[in-house]
């Protein structure tokens, strides 16, 4: 005959542990049922009665099988620089992550405690390493023969146009200006021209609270301001 299945509450065999989704109640000295996610223990078990579970109240949750007397409080509402990526339900806490153009300067177990705006690189500087969810943009000066004329958290330095006859030589923050004969561009054919307005909001070392408005496309920007360092180097 198969061994009889014990129903909670029951006294465990000496040296054995309670089964999955059960816990050992020290007071009753019995194996008792845990409460499912979204519930908590309203009444603890005794030698003769099992755990009584109840649903979590609004704005509280339990994520695991448990025997806690009260559900956990959901975190406070997401701040204006954050987006709610997971809502508060009876089974999960609210998760706030930084909105586009911001990164997490101080993380918590899940989501972000403090968001900060991504640094903007000023003209003459480009994005050496893009920002990630948890790290700021790194700005570096444009290398010889390249330039950036924007203040941006996404734009990289791009090559000066190559002139048959140069009217004004390029520098780190300005493209070369050619005389009327057509210039050649250090660019592969077929790249898309998407002009963007030039902004001059901040220095490369001083972040400003405006979000990045980098296009989400993979197109390159050969003729307008510098192409964005599209996407981010994630951690």
């Amino acid at each position: 005959l198969p061994a009889q299945v014990a129903f909670t509450p029951y006294a465990p065999e000496p040296g054995s542990t309670c089964r999955l989704r059960e816990y050992y109640d020290q007071t009753a000295q019995m194996c008792c049922s845990k409460c499912s996610p979204g519930q908590h223990a309203k009444v603890f078990c005794t030698k003769t009665s099992d755990t009584v579970c109840d649903s979590c109240e609004d704005s509280t949750y339990t994520q695991l099988w448990n025997w806690v007397p009260e559900c956990l409080s959901c975190g406070s509402r997401c701040s204006s620089d954050q987006v709610e990526t997971q809502a508060c339900t009876r089974e999960q806490n609210r998760i706030c992550t930084c909105r586009p153009g911001w990164y997490c300067a101080l993380s918590k177990q899940e989501g972000c405690r403090l968001c900060a705006p991504l640094r903007k690189c000023r003209p003459g500087f480009g994005v050496a390493r893009p920002g990630t969810e948890t790290s700021d943009v790194v700005c570096k000066p444009c290398a010889p023969g390249t330039f950036s004329n924007t203040t941006s958290s996404t734009d990289i330095c791009r090559p000066h146009q190559i002139c048959n006859v140069v009217a004004i030589p390029g520098n780190a923050s300005m493209d070369a200006v050619c005389t009327s004969t057509s210039p050649t561009r250090s660019m592969a054919p077929g790249a898309v021209h998407l002009p963007q307005p030039v902004s001059t909001r901040s220095q490369h070392t001083q972040p400003t609270p405006e979000p990045s408005t980098a296009p989400s496309t993979s197109f390159l920007l050969p003729m307008g301001p510098s192409p964005p360092a599209e996407g981010s180097t994630g951690d």
Epitope: P130, K140, A143, T146, L220, E230, G231, T233, G234
Partner: antibody
Framework: EVQLVQSGAEVKKPGATVKISCKVS????????LHWVQQAPGKGLEWMGW????????KYGQKFQSRVTITADTSTDTAYMELSSLRSEDTAVYYC???????????WGQGTLVTVSS | DIVMTQSPATLSVSPGERATLSCKAS??????VDWYQQKPGQSPRVLIY???IRYTGIPARFSGSGSGTEFTLTISILQSEDFAVYFC?????????FGQGTKLEIK
């Protein structure tokens, strides 16, 4: 034009530590991020990590994280890569590479051969 | 980690002809791909960055294209000095990863 000059070849025993230097000239080291890249004999390139000498921030590849330390001395415009607990498979050429505002590795050092042999 | 797969491993082409090298990413990397050339006994040098921007001083015969997961380096008219190993590299996410390389040899 920026130039990167690395220290000479090294022969090390397993378990030892090697420290390679990369001297930046022509520009200030703070104008660049400095990457370190490994190339084992007849193999491809493997990124080890970078340092931003301006802020002292580093980022390491997970494969090397426990054994590599990248530092920079802005007073001498020199970056260093230290690899510890060397094993035979660390026998490789190690390159430093400078990353400007283009977001790419614009300039590379000449490479340093490290041989790990008992 | 994002895996960059280059094909073919070896490409035999005659001087004056066109060479097309392929690089595929295991996941979307946007336009965050660079191409490097390495000759025997030398350090790599950047040719193309952000998938299609030719680095300053690189001859116009080199061009890059692609976005997402598929990238191509094209050398329009091969010169003798172009025979080398070519690597693609993604910088979309850490760790930065390189392809295993394509050896371009003289046919």
């Amino acid at each position: 034009e920026v130039q990167l000059v690395q220290s000479g070849a090294e022969v090390k025993k397993p378990g030892a530590t090697v420290k390679i230097s990369c001297k930046v000239s022509g520009y200030s080291i703070t104008d660049y991020l400095l990457h370190w890249v490994q190339q084992a004999p007849g193999k491809g390139l493997e990124w080890m990590g970078w340092i931003d000498p301006e802020e002292g921030k580093t980022k390491y590849g997970q494969k090397f994280q426990s054994r590599v330390t990248i530092t920079a001395d802005t007073s001498t415009d020199t970056a260093y890569m230290e690899l510890s607990s060397l094993r035979s498979e660390d026998t490789a050429v190690y390159y430093c590479a400078a990353n400007s505002g283009t977001g790419t590795m614009d300039a590379w050092g000449q490479g340093t051969l490290v041989t790990v042999s008992s | 980690d994002i895996v960059m797969t280059q094909s073919p491993a070896t490409l035999s082409v005659s001087p004056g002809e066109r060479a097309t090298l392929s690089c595929k990413a295991s996941q979307n990397v946007g336009s965050n791909v660079d191409w490097y050339q390495q000759k025997p006994g030398q350090s790599p040098r950047v040719l193309i960055y952000k998938a299609s921007i030719r680095y300053t001083g690189i001859p116009a015969r080199f061009s890059g294209s692609g976005s997402g997961t598929e990238f191509t380096l094209t050398i329009s008219i091969l010169q003798s000095e172009d025979f080398a190993v070519y690597f693609c590299m993604q910088s979309k996410s850490y760790p930065i990863t390189f392809g295993q390389g394509t050896k371009l040899e003289i046919k």
